[in-house]
């Protein structure tokens, strides 16, 4: 999916609003220097496609992320926000609404979440130059 | 089976506002995104905006914004679109629809439309 | 905003007879388009999403084809329930645009 045409501020603003606060309860008790963030971005659009793909797709040692409330409020945003976006998600499971008990969350996983958080504070600052 | 029902006609006078209901019954509410689409007599579809219930989050068309505002009541499972200083040219049925994936904005399913008429 | 343009603005046609209505997109909307049917006095009803996916319960004779800019939806052999207006809708863009509509009456 292409995100050229997201509206992007309105984005930012369910970031900084809820999506943000999410994503710190998940890592709670977790030290802010525990994890090197290793992926990056480049610009908005880039930012979140990388977001999409941490959030939704699973990797090894952390099968999903999907059912998280951080996953199920940036999944709305986007579908409200990227026109066309949730049509792109159709084969996706419509089983990660039925919320089951929180498994136990790896340190793959915590891991994951932070360099998301990275991503994010990247896609907050479009206009910084890359590291 | 998903329905939408929605509030009766409306003849409303121009500079006034109208607020149209559309209560969602068979199955879940909040994560399936609302959109508003009017037709005005005789001629084509036109969207209005949407929201996702789940969050309150609400797209509006550039050329409703700051005259409509759509919003979702959980717990009666209704949302509601209202558009203020209205003008004749706003006379027109006015549908909600839904989609029938999470926070989609396809639209699946429709409401019966309701008649706006404004006229002094 | 994008336009969407459909051709013809009518068409008549008789039953068994094969229709092709076609819809322009001002500018790349990729397959985000879909179509909608709508009967007088009627809300819209959904038959393709995705430029050429058939929704769920919408009779096999409608088709969609195309990507980019140029589209069609193709009834291979009209029904009399199939007279009614159409409508295309591009998807790839804010705020969400339709065509004007083609009507499709009986000869």
């Known amino acids: 999916y292409d995100f050229t045409n997201c509206d992007f501020e309105k984005i930012k603003a369910a970031y900084l609003s809820t999506i943000s606060k999410d994503l710190i309860t998940y890592m709670s008790g977790t030290k802010s220097t525990e994890f090197n963030n290793t992926v990056s971005c480049s610009n908005r659009p880039h930012c979140l496609t990388e977001i999409q793909s941490l959030t939704f797709n699973p990797t090894a040692g952390c099968a999903s992320l999907a059912k998280e409330m951080f996953a199920m409020k940036t999944k709305a945003a986007l579908a409200i926000w990227c026109p066309g976006y949730s049509e792109t998600q159709i084969n996706a499971t419509q089983a990660m609404k039925k919320r089951r008990k929180r498994k136990v969350t790896t340190n793959k996983c915590l891991e994951q979440v932070s360099q998301l958080q990275g991503l994010w504070r990247r896609f907050n600052r479009p206009l910084l130059k890359q590291q | 089976q998903v329905q939408l029902v929605q509030s009766g006609a409306e003849v409303k006078k121009p500079g006034s506002s109208v607020k149209v209901s559309c209560k969602a019954s068979?199955?879940?509410?909040?994560?399936?995104?609302i959109s508003w689409v009017r037709q005005a007599p005789g001629q084509g579809l036109e969207w209005m905006g949407g929201?996702?219930?789940?969050?309150?989050?609400?797209n509006y068309a550039q050329k409703f914004q700051g005259r409509v505002t759509i919003t979702a009541d959980e717990s009666t499972s209704t949302a509601y679109m209202e558009l203020s200083s209205l003008r004749s040219e706003d006379t027109a049925v006015y549908y909600c629809?839904?989609?029938?994936?999470?926070?989609?904005?396809?639209?699946?399913?429709w409401g019966q439309g309701t008649l706006v008429t404004v006229s002094s | 905003d994008i336009q969407m343009t459909q051709s013809p603005s009518s068409l008549s046609a008789s039953v068994g007879d094969r229709v092709t209505i076609t819809c322009r997109a001002s500018?790349?909307?990729?397959?985000?388009l879909n179509w909608y049917q709508q009967k007088p006095g009627k809300a819209p009803k959904l038959l393709i999403y995705?430029?050429?996916s058939l929704q769920s319960g919408v009779p096999s004779r409608f088709s969609g084809s195309g990507s980019g800019t140029d589209f069609t939806l193709t009834i291979s052999s009209l029904q009399p329930e199939d007279f009614a207006v159409y409508y295309c809708?591009?998807?790839?863009?804010?705020?969400?645009?339709f065509g004007q509509g083609t009507k499709v009456e009986i000869k």
């Open positions: 629809a839904r989609s029938g994936m999470f926070y989609s904005i396809l639209f699946d399913y």
């Open positions: 068979g199955g879940t509410f909040s994560s399936y995104a």
């Open positions: 929201i996702i219930p789940d969050f309150g989050w609400a």
């Open positions: 500018q790349d909307i990729y397959n985000y």
């Open positions: 995705g430029a050429s």
């Open positions: 809708q591009q998807q790839n863009d804010y705020p969400l645009t």
